[in-house]
């Protein structure tokens, strides 16, 4: 080994990953936003719609204050890429009545493929563990019918919407942290 | 500009320990996970060890599991391997790295030999 | 035995593009983790050369670029030139070892 030289400054560091996670999961929300609000005017739901293969939403505000890094990007990345199946299941199975929004669900799910990319990064510069927990993944199967890909599509936004809701806000807690 | 300077390394007889440490600047230690890494003569590079950017996360090799021991003083901006129980095939250069890594230091050479 | 694995070797003359594979398992790559690319000039330390699949750090030249589909991961080099020769390394996260894991290395002649 030669005498010690300097290395250049890469792109970014945690701290400017974490500011750009907070940025990609804000536009994402908004699009996710606007999504839903598509949704609900092609296809007006009749109530709350639920699917079992979701992942049940990780915070609530008053666990806010009590977040720590490591969990919350962990279970961020385990709740996207959750979601980001579904979304790809929405794509492929969802049927004519959902082709009309294919470029936005098209959108939203390289949005989220970007988001979860920036996670792992940020995850790989601070040595927090990679490996997601093991959780039973549930298959999922082609929608009973067209009204079934519809309400779906109704649940999956809503949650994705709730998850992210939450995600800002835990990122931007854990910003004062790092 | 980012320096990671390590130090400790050099000639052990087999059985025996050393200390490295690696001095770091120009950057948010604080901020990053670490990581060693050796090469041994003319070979590839074998990850070590890495430790979270708080210290509360660590890693090994299987290679290396209970005969190293890495830790950080985020207050000194130092990183450090403790290695006992030194084995011929540790002999390597072994370099500190940051993040990814995206930084890595110059490297500090450890020969095991008797 | 490297868990992710590379050509030993690869060539070109200046000018021409190579490139170089890293292939690995649903282990580590598979498991949607991304690929790394190091560069290791003779004599020197390594340095990162491609992060996150397809990420340049400031200062490395566009003539490299980097991919990853399914478990295998690849490395572009265009318009190559004489002080491109040096040994290239691909890493990625490993669930089953828990930790980062390295290619073999490749080592890279411009003839």
């Known amino acids: 080994p030669g005498p010690p030289a300097g290395s250049p400054r890469v792109s970014s560091d945690p701290r400017a990953d974490l500011d750009s996670a907070v940025l990609l999961t804000r536009s994402l929300l908004a699009d996710t936003r606007q999504l839903a609000a598509q949704m609900r005017d092609k296809f007006p739901a009749d109530g709350d719609h639920s699917l079992d293969s979701l992942p049940t939403l990780a915070m609530s505000a008053g666990t806010l204050g009590s977040l720590q890094l490591p969990g919350v990007l962990t279970r961020l990345r385990v709740d996207l890429m959750s979601y980001l199946r579904h979304v790809q299941w929405l794509r492929r199975a969802g049927g004519p009545s959902l082709k009309t929004l294919e470029p936005e669900l098209g959108a939203l799910q390289a949005r989220l493929e970007r988001l979860l990319r920036r996670l792992q990064l940020l995850m790989s510069r601070l040595a927090l563990p990679q490996a997601a927990p093991d959780q039973p993944v549930i298959p999922l199967g082609p929608p009973a019918s067209a009204w079934g890909s519809i309400r779906a599509a109704h649940a999956i936004l809503g949650g994705l919407h709730l998850t992210l809701d939450w995600a800002v806000r835990g990122l931007l807690l854990l910003k004062t942290r790092l | 500009e980012v320096q990671l300077l390590e130090s400790g390394g050099g000639l052990v007889q087999p059985g025996g320990s050393l200390r490295l440490s690696c001095a770091a600047s120009?950057?948010?230690?604080?901020?990053?996970?670490m990581h060693w890494v050796r090469q041994a003569p003319g070979k590839g590079l074998e990850w070590v060890s890495a430790?979270?950017?708080?210290?509360?996360?660590?890693y090994y090799a299987d290679s290396v599991k209970g005969r190293f021991t890495i830790s950080r003083d985020n207050s000194k901006n130092t990183l450090y391997l403790q290695m006992n129980s030194l084995r011929a095939e540790d002999t390597a250069v072994y370099y500190c790295?940051?993040?990814?890594?995206?930084?890595w230091g110059q490297g500090t050479l450890v020969t095991v030999s008797s | 035995q490297s868990v992710l694995t590379q050509p030993p070797s690869a060539s070109g003359t200046p000018g021409q593009r190579v490139t170089i594979s890293c292939t690995g398992s649903s282990s580590n790559i598979g498991a949607g983790y991304d690929v790394h690319w190091y560069q290791q000039l003779p004599g020197t330390a390594p340095k990162l050369l491609i992060y996150s699949n397809n990420e340049r750090p400031s200062g490395v030249p566009d003539r490299f670029s980097g991919s990853k589909s399914g478990t295998s991961a690849s490395l572009a080099i265009s318009g190559l030139r004489s002080e491109d020769e040096a040994d290239y390394y691909c890493?990625?996260?490993?669930?089953?070892?828990?930790?980062?894991?390295f290619g073999g290395g490749t080592k890279l002649t411009v003839l």
């Open positions: 120009g950057f948010t230690f604080s901020s990053y996970g």
């Open positions: 790295a940051a993040g990814v890594p995206d930084y």
């Open positions: 430790i979270s950017y708080d210290g509360s996360y660590k």
């Open positions: 890493a990625a996260w490993d669930d089953s070892l828990n930790g980062p894991v």
